[in-house]
């Protein structure tokens, strides 16, 4: 539990301290205070670097001091023989004695009190971005007019975030443009267009002036565009260094402008507009696109018609065309549908004839029917050759889709009759 | 067959055997058998066999049995109360529609029908082949197929032969242009049990083929001249009957 003051005495004080002792005290005062620790008595066996017996003062990881020997006050009006001032609210005191003492040593007496610290001046790092105000037990930061204190209660910035742009066309500029932009600010602008439109950002080189990068090439102030998982920037310097037209391929864009404490410039101004999302002209073999265009964009509809001998295969058997729409994500609907060669299937068998197993049953394949010779012949002509036609039927040049008919050969005995002489 | 020789079914693959009455027929396509009207007038559900040279029981059990679906007797055939006393064999022709199609092969295949052109008009002396399991010189019924080659003869030659066992006055027997007279050479003739079989003549337009110019019908006396139904005169009736009684698949 933190206390405002306290006393620390070596073991048996004011009697001699015992050998082989190690004792520590953890001092803690309330947050916002420092500690003033002072010794009024010090009588500890002297050794080089206080290696035998010592009292150690540690603040965090830092050893503030290590004491041994006898001390007396330099000031006749003050009993203090040694003192320490730390700007932190915690301190550790450790007393150690070795296995022997050549004389009788009485140890030490020390006192601590909580002291106010000036956070605004006592530290190398300035706690406030703008104005620092000290008070007993703490401090607070404040801001110039038109600035506001951030949630960290230390940094001041301008109120430049939260704008959402939904119009298909618009203009966005840094705060105070073309006057210098505020330091130490993070401005976030959101562009949110209807799905199916991509944000296209246009900047003129002369409309951009942001504090230049440091010697390592890192932007001190920066403008960044984030579209989904794609990032454009960071950009900084005099004159826009990026592409003057940024096609984001997304309907959502976040613009982030980050500034540091120094070096304000006039800032930047950009225009944006929504372009219908383009869909690539995909290579769909064995088909024709109607209408044919150089570029297709969101909401465009095309009819994809299969060439003769090809059909759309997926559930809808035998369809020769399908519609595809350019979708909001830049992809075509029905993109899985393909024009595949028509499959005429296994040809039907015929009575008293046969058809050899075709190597393929796809469009253009050829099969041949034969009759069981010499007992049957093909009655309806056509030669027995059929090809797989575009309509999915096996077709003969003479008979069309009609199958050949094998009919018996008549009047032909397998062996001629020979009269036996009687 | 009188005066004939042993034949193999491969010589006459169109030959059909009827077991009741004992007779013959000619296969003309997968579904139809042509025979004489007098063969089927008394049995409208004949059992027929194809593909066997011998009609021994063991052979028929291995041959193809044909089951009739319907018998079509020519409308001009006069049905009698007492068929045994018949003297008029005009229009002695019938068709049997089969239940199932016949599978053709070396021992079973049809005979052609005559064309309608004058090429198929028979001249005296034209040779034809007859076959069957009917009476021979030795036995009432042949065990194995017999056949003979005999010439077409003028109708008067048949008229001149005295009927062996007349059931009526000799003048009562009817002779018409629907009949072919053939035989008279070396005693070769068809006989009882050969009825309905084909009188097969070489096709004038394709020498490799035979057509059914006639069907064994009747005769005055076995071993002389025989009378055969002139099939050419019935081609229209045959085609019409087959067309009107075919399944759509056959069309």
């Amino acid at each position: 539990e933190p206390t405002m003051y306290g006393e620390i005495l070596s073991p048996n004080y004011p009697q001699a301290y015992p050998s082989e002792v190690e004792k520590s005290w953890d001092i803690e005062v309330p947050e916002g205070y420092g500690i003033h620790l002072y010794f009024t008595h010090l009588d500890i066996e002297l050794s080089e670097n206080c290696a035998y017996d010592s009292v150690q003062i540690i603040s965090g990881d830092t050893e503030e001091g290590r004491l041994c020997g006898q001390r007396s006050s330099n000031n006749p009006h003050s009993p203090i023989v040694e003192e320490f001032q730390v700007p932190y609210n915690k301190l550790q005191v450790i007393f150690k004695s070795d296995f022997s003492n050549e004389e009788r040593f009485t140890g030490f007496a020390a006192y601590y009190v909580a002291t106010d610290i000036n956070e605004c001046t006592d530290f190398v790092d300035v706690p406030c971005s703008h104005f620092c105000n000290n008070f007993i037990g703490g401090y607070f930061c404040s801001c110039p007019p038109e600035y506001f204190l951030h949630d960290d209660m230390k940094n001041c910035g301008v109120n430049c975030s939260g704008d959402v742009f939904t119009a298909l066309i618009g203009e966005i500029a840094s705060p105070n443009y073309p006057k210098p932009y505020p330091e130490n600010s993070r401005c976030e602008y959101q562009i949110r267009l209807e799905k199916g439109f991509q944000v296209v950002v246009t900047l003129r080189r002369e409309d951009f002036d942001v504090e230049a990068a440091d010697s390592a090439g890192n932007c001190l102030d920066s403008l960044v565009f984030v579209a989904g998982d794609r990032q454009f920037g960071p950009y900084c310097g005099h004159g826009f260094p990026g592409p003057l037209n940024i096609e984001t391929k997304s309907n959502a864009l976040d613009i982030i402008f980050q500034t540091d404490l120094t070096g304000q410039k006039k800032g930047w101004k950009l225009r944006y507009h929504g372009d219908p999302m383009p869909c690539p002209k995909e290579d769909t073999p064995n088909s024709v696109w109607e209408p044919a265009k150089a570029k297709y964009v969101f909401r465009d509809v095309v009819q994809i018609t299969c060439l003769d001998g090809f059909e759309v295969v997926e559930g809808r058997v035998g369809a020769t065309s399908f519609y595809s729409t350019c979708q909001s994500n830049g992809k075509w609907s029905n993109s899985k549908l393909k024009c595949q060669p028509v499959d005429c299937g296994i040809p039907e068998s015929i009575e008293n004839g046969k058809v050899e197993d075709p190597e393929s049953t796809l469009f253009g394949s050829v099969i041949r029917y034969t009759c069981e010779e010499p007992y049957y012949y093909m009655e309806n002509g056509g030669g027995g050759e059929y090809h797989c036609a575009g309509n999915g039927s096996w077709v003969n040049e003479v008979l069309g889709p009609e199958l050949p008919k094998c009919v018996p050969v008549c009047g032909v005995p397998r062996e001629p009759f020979e009269e036996k002489q009687r | 067959i009188i005066g004939g020789s042993d034949a193999d079914i491969k010589n006459f693959p169109w030959q059909v055997f009827f077991d009741n009455p004992w007779a013959g027929g000619a296969l003309i396509n997968e579904y139809w058998v042509l025979t004489a009207a007098h063969v089927v007038e008394g049995n409208r559900e004949p059992t027929m066999y194809v593909g066997s040279t011998s009609v021994q029981t063991s052979r028929l059990a291995k041959s193809k049995m044909l089951t009739p679906e319907h018998v079509f007797i020519h409308p001009g055939w006069k049905l009698l109360e007492v068929p045994e006393g018949r003297t008029n064999f005009d229009n002695d022709i019938a068709l049997v529609r089969l239940k199932d199609p016949v599978k053709m092969g070396p021992t079973v295949s049809p005979i052609c029908l005559p064309g309608t052109s004058s090429d198929y008009n028979l001249m005296d002396g034209d040779l034809g082949l007859i076959s069957g399991w009917g009476r021979t010189e030795k036995r009432d019924r042949a065990v194995r197929l017999k056949a003979a080659r005999l010439p077409v003869a003028p109708l008067r030659k048949c008229k001149e032969v005295k009927v062996e066992k007349p059931t009526a006055d000799a003048e009562a027997y009817v002779f018409t242009p629907n009949m072919i007279c053939a035989g008279g050479e070396k005693g070769m003739d068809s006989c009882k049990g050969d009825s309905g079989g084909a009188f097969a003549v070489q096709d004038p337009n394709d020498k490799t083929k035979f057509y059914a110019a006639g069907l064994v019908s009747w005769g005055p006396q076995c071993g002389t001249y025989g009378l055969y139904t002139r099939v050419k005169n019935y081609v229209d009736w045959i085609m019409k009957t087959m067309q009107e009684n075919s399944t759509p698949r056959e069309d």
Epitope: - | W22, Q56, S58, K138
Partner: antibody, heavy 119, light 107 residues
Framework: EVQLVQSGAEVKKPGASVKVSCKVS????????MHWVRQAPGKGLEWMGT????????IYAQKFQGRVTMTEDTSTDTAYMELSSLRSEDTAVYYC????????????WGQGTLVTVSS | DIQMTQSPSTLSASVGDRVTITCRAS??????LAWYQQKPGKAPKLLIY???SLESGVPSRFSGSGSGTEFTLTISSLQPDDFATYYC?????????FGQGTKVEIK
């Protein structure tokens, strides 16, 4: 009129062979198919085998395979049936029978030959 | 070889009775079945062939039916001359076989 005349009765010792003849009169053997059937005393009919003229082969019932031989002498129109390795259970009347036509299995039966096998 | 099984083995009946004898084939024989009647010391006499065809000269009281594997011989009204042994015989395969016989005796 066709007739089948068989050889006379025979008495044989076990292990011996017997040859029964069957002469056709009134027809020729070549036109017929001859079968052989036997009947043991008080027992049923047993088909033994036949010569198939169409295939030119002799067909025997499995029971007699290896023990029976059927032959024909067409010059005398006589059929023969020889049964070897006789045993007492071969005692039977042996018939020659002609095959019928058009579904009739047996047409004509010989008068039968009694073969007695006894030691 | 195809097995033929006749039932019953013995049948006692009276004159005028309707008698049925059954024959079963071990495999299908279509209609290639015959029925014979045999009297002691005589050769068998053919009654029925092709399962149902009556041999000429056989009285019409005898009839046969069936096809495939099941066959019957029926005597519609038993006569004194009909007391004998009856055999079925298949002639579908060339290894012909007989049934074991059914003896019809006077009750």
């Amino acid at each position: 009129e066709v007739q089948l005349v068989q050889s006379g009765a025979e008495v044989k010792k076990p292990g011996a062979s017997v040859k029964v003849s069957c002469k056709v009169s009134g027809d020729t053997l070549t036109e017929l198919s001859m079968h052989w059937v036997r009947q043991a005393p008080g027992k049923g009919l047993e088909w033994m085998g036949t010569f198939d003229p169409e295939e030119g082969e002799t067909i025997y019932a499995q029971k007699f395979q290896g023990r029976v031989t059927m032959t024909e002498d067409t010059s005398t129109d006589t059929a023969y049936m020889e049964l070897s390795s006789l045993r007492s259970e071969d005692t039977a009347v042996y018939y020659c029978v002609t095959e019928g036509l058009a579904g009739v299995p047996f047409d004509l039966w010989g008068q039968g030959t009694l073969v007695t096998v006894s030691s | 070889d195809i097995q033929m099984t006749q039932s019953p083995s013995t049948l006692s009946a009276s004159v005028g009775d309707r008698v049925t004898i059954t024959c079963r084939a071990s495999q299908s024989i279509s209609s290639w079945l015959a029925w014979y009647q045999q009297k002691p010391g005589k050769a068998p006499k053919l009654l029925i062939y092709k399962a149902s065809s009556l041999e000429s000269g056989v009285p019409s009281r005898f009839s046969g039916s069936g096809s495939g594997t099941e066959f019957t011989l029926t005597i519609s009204s038993l006569q004194p001359d009909d007391f004998a042994t009856y055999y079925c015989q298949q002639h579908n395969s060339y290894r012909w076989t007989f049934g074991q016989g059914t003896k019809v005796e006077i009750k």
